[in-house]
Interface confidence: medium
């Protein structure tokens, strides 16, 4: 019964969040805000199984988001009271415990207003500092409810990185784009997590002809094209981005003229995949692969998908190829020979090689990164509430929908596919070697484009020496601390996660005249080949619903420490049957939180409402003021107590 109630509330919440929402900072004395805080604190206290209740100390920040429903996002400080949790008293009836012996805390919550009296907690994180001891974090997320999260949340970082790379790989614009500003972000806890992020992008001075990916040299062009993208991502039970979709509007720059292309001697250029100059390079490459691979059997190159060469001090080759497991075992064969045939049901590897050839030294230095291809786990959508997704399984592809201003949309392009092949020993997982495209960002020296599915490894966002460049203006994303999402952990992400905020000159230049398309779900599994559409002025679409496992009440900590591309590749479904196309532009609200626009001036005691300032003064007077120590901003998600 409890589950049904929650699902009903969540679905109602979802349906009610379909219209555009506006955010505003509000007075920390606002009466409805106080009711929201009351609901949040009562929720926290109800989950506190032992010890004393916590009592409000003061509200420090508050934002109100008004749409068809109203949300309050706020921070408040709490102190341990003298009433036990089981005392039957409300927190208002408790006094503060003696400061020296009292725990203190800071909570960040988002609460939805359902009616003048009904407030429901969507998400809440509390960092509690015991009187003596380390900070403890508790988290509550309403299971299935969509709620806004901070645009600076580090949880967004891997999705943003993936999104920017995906945009650059899948549109026909001649230049690379970089992240400008994250506008809004929402999250929904399901069996895994759904994210929806809207952000602006800006054209850089790096042309695709000369740059394979964003580097620190790529700078935004003040008069270049801009765009706004909405990315939709589902992070599954295996901690990978299981589905990803993107919808971008592009706005032409003011009087922008593409600078003349210079002849670039050191820039990579395509070479034929059957070029004789690749022969020796490939031999060394497969030798290196077999030497580094712990597999029992040798692999051989099945087909070369793409090859580029760059003239450096010597030559550097970038080769994308598929390797297949052979019948020759390493035990019985000293080396791979021509007679080694590929196994019918052997593993396939999607590989990217970077081979440095120094002719005058007669030396070849290959580096190879591979990931398994084709052994895919079937993901079924279970029965139960899943408001984000349509109900049937469809073909899985990844999409960028680019919508230009003043242009009609070209029809959806169906990318060329290789036929599926049965893999492994299971009768149910029956698709295999698809042409794919990799979406790596900031790879330093790697040009890795074809992203396989399955458990591929070593293809990280931010591998090598150029981790995560070009997402913000000079701001590096670095997730170097574990992001613990509940009990017992302090998160130290702080202000490392700036997504290039505040570059107003790139904010679409007031040209939002392109139609923003309805959201199309699609999936990271078999990613599309290079689009065949002629330019970014047409829309490139592939569609299909995303499977979501059933809702549950998880009780674990999810940690995003150093999220890499190898973690983004999901176990996915085979394309069983086509699904009806479903637009779901309104499955998540446009809710904006401005975490930077909050002032910190003292205000009068509640309920005086004349001064619209934050933080509020203490809820009750306390003999020894001992506010919670300022902590670095931390963002969490946890699946705990979703059904409590």
């Amino acid at each position: 019964m409890k589950l049904i109630t929650i699902l009903f509330l969540c679905s109602r919440l979802l349906l009610s969040l379909t219209q555009e929402s506006q955010s505003e900072e509000i007075d920390c004395n606002d009466k409805d805000l106080f009711k929201a805080v009351d609901a949040a604190l009562k929720k926290y206290n109800s989950q506190n199984q032992s010890n004393n209740q916590f009592v409000l100390y003061r509200i420090t920040e508050a934002t109100k988001t008004v749409g068809s429903d109203t949300f309050y996002s706020f921070k408040y400080e709490i102190k341990e009271g003298d009433c036990p949790v089981q005392s039957g008293k409300t927190w208002q009836d408790c006094e503060y415990k003696d400061a020296a012996k009292a725990a203190t805390g800071e909570c960040t919550a988002t609460v939805g207003k359902r009616s003048s009296t009904k407030f429901s907690v969507a998400t809440q994180t509390c960092q509690i500092t015991p009187a003596e001891g380390p900070v403890v974090t508790a988290q509550y997320d309403c299971l299935g409810c969509v709620h806004p999260i901070s645009t600076q949340s580090p949880d967004l970082e891997p999705i943003l990185r993936h999104g920017i790379q995906y945009f650059n790989n899948n549109t026909q614009h001649s230049s690379l784009f970089m992240l400008n500003e994250v506008k809004r972000a929402q999250r929904q806890v399901v069996a895994g997590l759904n994210f929806r992020i809207t952000y602006s992008i800006v054209q850089t001075n790096c042309s695709k002809e000369n740059f394979l990916f964003l580097t620190p040299d790529c700078k935004s062009l003040w008069n270049g094209d801009t765009g706004e993208c909405t990315d939709n991502a589902y992070i599954d039970i295996q901690l990978r981005i299981a589905s990803f979709s993107q919808n971008c509007d592009i706005y032409p720059g003011k009087d922008f003229v593409q600078p003349p292309t210079k002849i670039c001697v050191g820039c990579p250029r395509d070479i034929p995949t059957n070029s004789p100059e690749l022969e020796e390079t490939l031999t060394h490459t497969i030798t290196k692969l077999n030497a580094e691979n712990n597999a029992t059997f040798y692999f051989k190159i099945d087909n070369v998908k793409k090859a580029r060469v760059q003239v450096v001090a010597g030559k550097k080759y970038f080769i994308d190829f598929v390797a297949r497991e052979t019948t020759c075992s390493k035990e019985s064969n000293e080396e791979l020979t021509e007679s080694c045939e590929t196994k019918k049901l052997g593993q396939s590897l999607d590989c990217n090689a970077e081979v440095y050839v120094v002719p005058w030294e007669k030396k070849i230095y290959p580096t190879v990164n591979c990931q398994p291809l084709g052994m895919i786990s079937l993901m079924k959508r279970p029965p139960g509430f899943s408001p984000f997704r349509s109900s049937r399984i469809g073909e899985i592809k990844e999409e960028t929908t680019v919508s230009p201003p003043h242009t009609s949309m070209a029809p959806a392009q169906d990318e060329e596919r290789d036929s599926g092949k049965e893999q492994g020993h299971t009768r149910r997982h029956d698709w295999g070697h698809e042409k794919q495209r990799k979406h790596n960002l900031g790879h330093g020296h790697k040009h890795e484009r074809d992203q396989g599915h399955g458990h591929q490894r070593g293809h990280g966002l931010g591998h090598g020496h150029e981790q995560q460049h070009g997402l913000g203006h000079g701001h590096k994303f670095k997730l170097d601390d574990d992001l613990e999402h509940q009990g017992g952990h302090v998160l130290d992400h702080g202000h490392k996660h700036k997504h290039g905020h505040g570059h107003g000159k790139h904010k679409n230049k007031g040209k939002k005249n392109g139609k923003h398309n309805g959201w199309k779900t699609e999936h990271l599994a078999s990613s599309s080949e290079d689009s065949t559409t002629p330019s970014a002025q047409t829309q490139e679409k592939t569609e299909g619903p995303t499977p979501i496992p059933s809702l549950a009440k998880p009780g674990v900590t999810v940690t995003f420490s150093d999220f890499q591309d190898s973690d983004l590749i999901a176990t996915m479904m085979p394309p069983i049957s086509p699904a009806p196309i479903q637009s779901d532009d309104d499955w998540i609200p446009d809710i904006q939180i401005d975490p930077n626009g909050l002032s910190f001036n003292p205000i009068s005691d509640f309920p005086d409402t004349t001064s619209p300032k934050c933080p509020g003064r203490p809820w009750k007077s306390v003999s020894e003021i001992n506010p919670t120590t300022q902590m670095k901003e931390s963002y969490y998600f946890d699946l705990t107590d979703g059904l409590s």
């Epitope: 895994g192 052994m375 279970p382 299971t426 458990h455 591929q456 490894r457 496992p549 009440k553 420490s561």
Partner: antibody
Amino acid sequence: EVQLLESGGGLVQPGGSLRLSCAASGFTFSYYGMNWVRQAPGKGLEWVSVISPSGGLTVYADSVKGRFTISRDNSKNTLYLQMNSLRAEDTAMYYCATGFAVQHGGGAFDIWGQGTMVTVSS
Amino acid sequence: DIQMTQSPATLSMSPGERATLSCRASQSVTTYLAWYQQKPGQAPRLLIYDASIRATGVPARFSGSGSGTDFTLTISRLEPEDFAVYYCQQRTIWPLTFGGGTKVEIK
């Protein structure tokens, strides 16, 4: 031959620390998410933690979070479990495990180590 | 957390008999359910995953069925080596959880 070999178990006092290792061989370790699963004497199996192939993502069971840290060194084909603030209830056989066959999606474990015993007692 | 409940706790059978083990989830796990066999002093061994798919090398006498919340492991004809403890496990959502086990012993 695909193999996982745990080590590092032993007797430790409550509040103490221990670091378990799991050496992998016979497969490309860096392709797979790795898990720790434990089993208290005479009891059932309890999943402890998982780490993604690159080590970037980790998940912990409630019972260990904040005390245990899972990590991996792909260059050494080794999985680790750093256990701090150990309690008597952490006494168990600790197994590392993975869903080696890709089809399993990492959630069903067909490769297990032989286990290493951790005893927390004063 | 999703609770996994196995029944019976102990099953006393003779070789050659048909054994039916039950596993119930506190909420739907679709078909994301695995069965393991564990013998004393050994690590568990995966028998069935995704409710009904036999893992490599598992004899055909082992079969799994069910979806949602109710699952069954059937051993069509018990062999002497089948006497062991059997666990079910869901992989729908964090944390992954196991049932308490069913001990299949010789009558």
